[in-house]
Interface confidence: medium
Amino acid sequence: APRGTQAEESPFVGNPGNITGARGLTGTLRCQLQVQGEPPEVHWLRDGQILELADSTQTQVPLGEDEQDDWIVVSQLRITSLQLSDTGQYQCLVFLGHQTFVSQPGYVGLEGLPYFLEEPEDRTVAANTPFNLSCQAQGPPEPVDLLWLQDAVPLATAPGHGPQRSLHVPGLNKTSSFSCEAHNAKGVTTSRTATITVLPQQPRNLHLVSRQPTELEVAWTPGLSGIYPLTHCTLQAVLSDDGMGIQAGEPDPPEEPLTSQASVPPHQLRLGSLHPHTPYHIRVACTSSQGPSSWTHWLPVETPEGVPLGPPENISATRNGSQAFVHWQEPRAPLQGTLLGYRLAYQGQDTPEVLMDIGLRQEVTLELQGDGSVSNLTVCVAAYTAAGDGPWSLPVPLEAWRPGQAQPVHQLVKEPSTPAFSWPW
């Protein structure tokens, strides 16, 4: 019977050796077997599992000229940059006929200086604000003890006596560096040095101080900034749009914001050139030499309505018998809000002024009746928004009243319609 077909006779003439080394080591495991006839494919096992994607090479050398002569087969498994996941028991496996043969095991072990699984990262933190840093290392050999350092000064008397994987820092008032050392029986490894940059705290209590139709005065309370004085604060304002739905935590404004810089102190800024009666969202961040704070949440604000900037136009005051007819047109100047209506004031030379609230109509008829007489009757008209009256027009005279004619009493001749608007309560 051909050699290798009997269970007690192993074809393996060379078994994997042992490798123990530090991370990153490159090593090779080898198996060698001698078989009669066609050489089999050699498989590698780690901890009993076939390695499907093993970096292995197989060399076959015939020992005779006949195909049925013996063959030497050498399989090499290359381990590049040894990692913890590479450790374990390695064997070679071949199928010969109806039998399976497995080599003696070899062992791959890892032992050396500690290896960092996690190192502290650079980050920015707000002044006097708690944060955590992480560091994780492993052997073998175990145990691995950590020692944290701040600005190169150890934070504990000896490795293993201070915080281990997570370092809780209650707050910093200046930019600092942190690193950790990992200690085991083989020696010490030092992590990267993380720079923790101390930025100003987010400003608080952003609020409106005063509102004008085209400007908003806002103020805020600065946050702590450590040993670094604030150099300036930056305010952003963006037109609100109900369709955009700026959320409190939304990271970026939906459109290019209006950006203004404020010297500090005072922590106050007047934002000008705004639209009247318009909703905005504003936010503020403050900057020191180390960089800017985080933005405050977007604060919804609104410029108030203003009064119309000009009087009604083209005022006409004509008299026809016992009636005086007055009409006008909407001001050409900006209304600075929603036009709510018009007020009309008329006055004779020796009579008190009478004020009329006309609503949104643009005409009124004064019915002249009674026993008194009035001369030099003049009429003024002003438009108004919810913010109040705009400028009054210059007095428009009616033609002179003849002596003995009536004291004017007004009434509207035309049937009015109900105002088609609602008030912003």
Epitope: L340, G341, V409
Partner: antibody
Framework: EVNLVESGGGVVKPGASLKLSCEAS????????MSWVRQTSDKRLEWVAS????????YYLDNVKGRFIISRENAKNTLYLQMSSLKSEDTALFYC?????????????WGQGSSVTVSS | VIVMTQSHKFMSTSVGDRVSITCKAS??????VAWYQQKPGQSPKLLIY???TRHTGVPDRFTGSGSGTDYSLTISNVQTEDLAFYYC?????????FGAGTKLELK
């Protein structure tokens, strides 16, 4: 919350003077026209006087013109009614009222009133 | 002077009823009419202005209507808390004038 509080009422003899005050809070006082309205014992409401938000325009009921003066001090959020040459027919509960934004001749908030009695 | 006339000094109603209080102006006031409610011991409260605009917080069972010289305040589904005096006022021009009031009471 809009709040109007009148003070200064009392019992006086005909011909005497009295000054009513109305302290406003809960809104931007200077943005609103204000009025005084009185209510007689027969429950009738009678407008007395009005003043524009800035104080530049004043309007009076004919039979108080020359006797009453409406004024305001926006820095103190206070409306005043100085009454002189009081008559028995001035006896009433005097209300201070805020003009609505849509028409300051419509009064959207009223105080609780200050009583004025003119009697010999 | 514009005279505001409330022809009914008293109106009787029942809870759940619909009632209309009327007011007539002596001349056209272009819908510049306000309605107030006054309960005993309280100051007047604005219900309606510009004839039909409801003041903030006023229940929608109160409805104002009218134009020219004729105006009305309608209370649908009358509640016991609606029993009070109701006054109309023209806010069109000075001198501002009120109606004499209508007392809404239970039948």
């Amino acid at each position: 919350e809009v709040n109007l509080v009148e003070s200064g009422g009392g019992v006086v003899k005909p011909g005497a003077s009295l000054k009513l005050s109305c302290e406003a809070s809960g809104f931007t006082f200077s943005n609103y026209g204000m009025s005084w309205v009185r209510q007689t014992s027969d429950k009738r409401l009678e407008w007395v006087a009005s003043i524009s938000g800035g104080g530049g325009r004043t309007y009076y009921l004919d039979n108080v013109k020359g006797r009453f003066i409406i004024s305001r001090e926006n820095a103190k959020n206070t409306l005043y009614l100085q009454m002189s040459s009081l008559k028995s027919e001035d006896t009433a509960l005097f209300y201070c009222a805020r003009g609505a934004r849509a028409s300051y001749f419509a009064m959207d908030y009223w105080g609780q009133g200050s009583s004025v009695t003119v009697s010999s | 002077v514009i005279v505001m006339t409330q022809s009914h000094k008293f109106m009787s109603t029942s809870v759940g009823d619909r009632v209309s209080i009327t007011c007539k102006a002596s001349q056209d006031v272009t819908t510049a009419v306000a309605w107030y409610q006054q309960k005993p011991g309280q100051s007047p409260k604005l219900l309606i202005y510009w004839a039909s605009t409801r003041h903030t917080g006023v229940p929608d069972r109160f409805t104002g209507s009218g134009s020219g010289t004729d105006y009305s305040l309608t209370i649908s589904n009358v509640q016991t808390e609606d029993l009070a005096f109701y006054y109309c006022q023209q806010h069109f021009t000075t001198p501002l004038t009120f109606g004499a009031g209508t007392k809404l009471e239970l039948k």
